[in-house]
């Protein structure tokens, strides 16, 4: 089969729940901070429901860094089972964006911010320091990648990943379009290409998840993530068979068997598939 | 002088419900949020409850959230705990304590509560 | 849970200080300058000695002292006299919990 064929493969799960955080900062992004040291830790990622590794610069970031695996997946995962992931950019905002601003019972008066259910916006309000709820964040930024809604309704995306016209290199984007896909695959495909520490100039590929493909990029030989394979069909294999195509109503979906073009129609999370 | 008095505790079945009281007197009640805290035979202090100044907010521990309820009354200078589907490891000396801004600077001399069939 | 870890048992002389440690995670004790430590002798209820991590309440002796290092709050006690024999915890908060740690039981010898 050549890679167009086997490019859209439908597969259906039972969908993830809303996503619940144990604390707030586990919401947070990784921040490695200013400082240049090399650190291993790991945060908990909202997108893919994991903690996972990154490199923490030794000073400042925020609370969403844990110095071992367990202690991240005791603070940020009410349980640890393996399930298939689900992203999608039309996911549900999670629970405790609808819940009211909730000061608590200390008098730390911290600026904090909160998704304010009345205006669609995240606000400023004062934190006691303890207590409160979890629609509670440390920056505005925060708020309204958790919270707010992108053009056209959408959930904002925290992590796509765009190809650079300028200088060819990958660059983590806020990406605040709606996504054309949805991905039931390995956590790590959805991550971006990570060059890794070293100076090495490796020719790897990794999955973009934005665009749904394999793309070549180059390794520095140490470091990086799991998305990161020494071939195309390497990359192919563990990351596509999770990937299918959104669509537009009335839109065309292609599967990896060659059928014919089937007229689908998309509500929401839902696929309706007609004379299948 | 600044006192707070727990009455309520004594011996109840597993599934059986206790209503604690904490009486309040010598500073002003409604500026405080209350909080309650256990401890079990020989064992540390755990967080139970809390509740604000006004009422209008209450907090749980995970280990009571949905079975026990804080409230208060502050016509009355008097703090609740209502609990409800006891459990074994709910026996404790059950504390009412107010909370001056995350620490407990007012303490109760305490209520036992048993949970024993 | 969350959880704030203390040792079991510290022990000193009358007149020596000891000091008693209070680890926890990143989003409780690192998190905030609220650690505050609590005397209880057998049978009574528990005593504020120290609140954001180094003030005293009015009445408290100043023999007693906290400090706070990362994640790592400390209470030390400098001329230890038999009446300091008690049970000592620290506490913190985050948005969930108000949470103590395990308790460490002081033994002046």
């Known amino acids: 089969d050549s890679e167009e064929d086997e490019e859209h493969t439908i597969i259906t799960d039972t969908e993830l729940p809303p996503l619940k955080l144990m604390h707030s900062f586990c919401a947070f992004k990784a921040d490695d901070g200013p400082c240049k040291a090399i650190m291993k830790r790991f945060f908990f990622n909202i997108f893919t429901r994991q903690c996972e590794e990154f490199i923490y610069g030794g000073c400042e970031g925020n609370q969403n860094r844990f110095e071992s695996l367990e202690e991240c997946k005791k603070m940020c995962t009410r349980d640890n089972a393996n399930r298939i992931i689900k992203t999608t950019l039309q996911q549900e905002k999670p629970d405790f964006c609808f819940l009211e601003e909730d000061p608590g019972i200390c008098r730390g008066y911290i600026t904090r911010y909160f998704y304010n259910n009345q205006t669609k916006q995240c606000e400023r309000f004062k934190y006691g320091g303890c207590l409160g709820n979890m629609n509670n964040f440390e920056t505005l930024e925060e708020c309204k990648n958790i919270c707010e809604d992108g053009p056209n309704g959408f959930q904002v995306d925290n992590y796509g990943t765009q190809l650079n016209a300028v200088n060819n290199s990958l660059t983590p984007q806020s990406t605040k379009v709606p996504s054309l896909f949805e991905f039931h695959g390995p956590s790590w495909c959805l991550t971006p290409a990570d060059r890794g520490l070293c100076r090495a100039n490796e020719n790897r590929f990794y999955y973009n998840s934005v665009i749904g493909k394999c793309r070549p990029f180059k390794y520095s030989g140490c470091g990086g993530n799991e998305n990161n394979f020494t071939s195309k069909q390497e990359c192919l294999r563990a990351c596509k068979k999770g990937f299918i195509q959104r669509i537009s109503k009335g839109g065309l979906i292609k599967t990896k068997r060659k059928r014919k073009k089937q007229r689908v129609k998309i509500a929401y999370e839902e696929i309706f598939v007609k004379n299948m | 002088q600044v006192q707070l008095v727990e009455s309520g505790g004594g011996l109840v079945q597993p599934g059986g419900s206790l209503r604690l009281s904490c009486a309040a007197s010598g500073f002003t009640f409604n500026s405080y949020a209350m909080t309650w805290v256990r401890q079990a035979p020989g064992k540390g202090l755990e967080w139970v409850s809390a509740?604000?100044?006004?009422?209008?907010?209450?907090y749980y521990a995970d280990s009571v959230k949905g079975r026990f309820t804080i409230s208060r009354d502050n016509s009355k200078n008097t703090l609740y705990l209502q609990m409800n589907s006891l459990r074994a490891e709910d026996t404790a000396v059950y504390y009412c304590a107010r909370n001056d801004s995350g620490w407990f600077d007012v303490w109760g001399q305490g209520t036992l509560v048993t949970v024993s069939s | 849970d969350i959880a704030l870890t203390q040792p079991a048992s510290v022990s000193g002389s009358p007149g020596q200080s000891i000091t008693i440690s209070c680890t926890g995670t990143?989003?409780?004790?690192?998190?905030?300058?609220?650690v505050s430590w609590y005397q209880q002798h057998p049978g009574k209820a528990p005593k504020l000695m120290i609140y954001s991590v180094s003030s005293r309440p009015s009445g408290v002796s100043n023999r007693f002292s906290g400090s706070k290092s990362g994640n790592t709050a400390s209470l030390t006690i400098s001329g230890l006299q038999a009446e300091d024999e008690a049970d000592y915890y620290c506490?913190?908060?985050?948005?969930?919990?108000?949470?103590f740690g395990g308790g460490t039981k002081l033994t002046v010898l």
């Open positions: 506490q913190s908060y985050d948005l969930n919990n108000l949470v």
């Open positions: 990143s989003s409780d004790l690192g998190g905030f300058n609220t």
């Open positions: 509740i604000k100044s006004d009422g209008s907010n209450t």
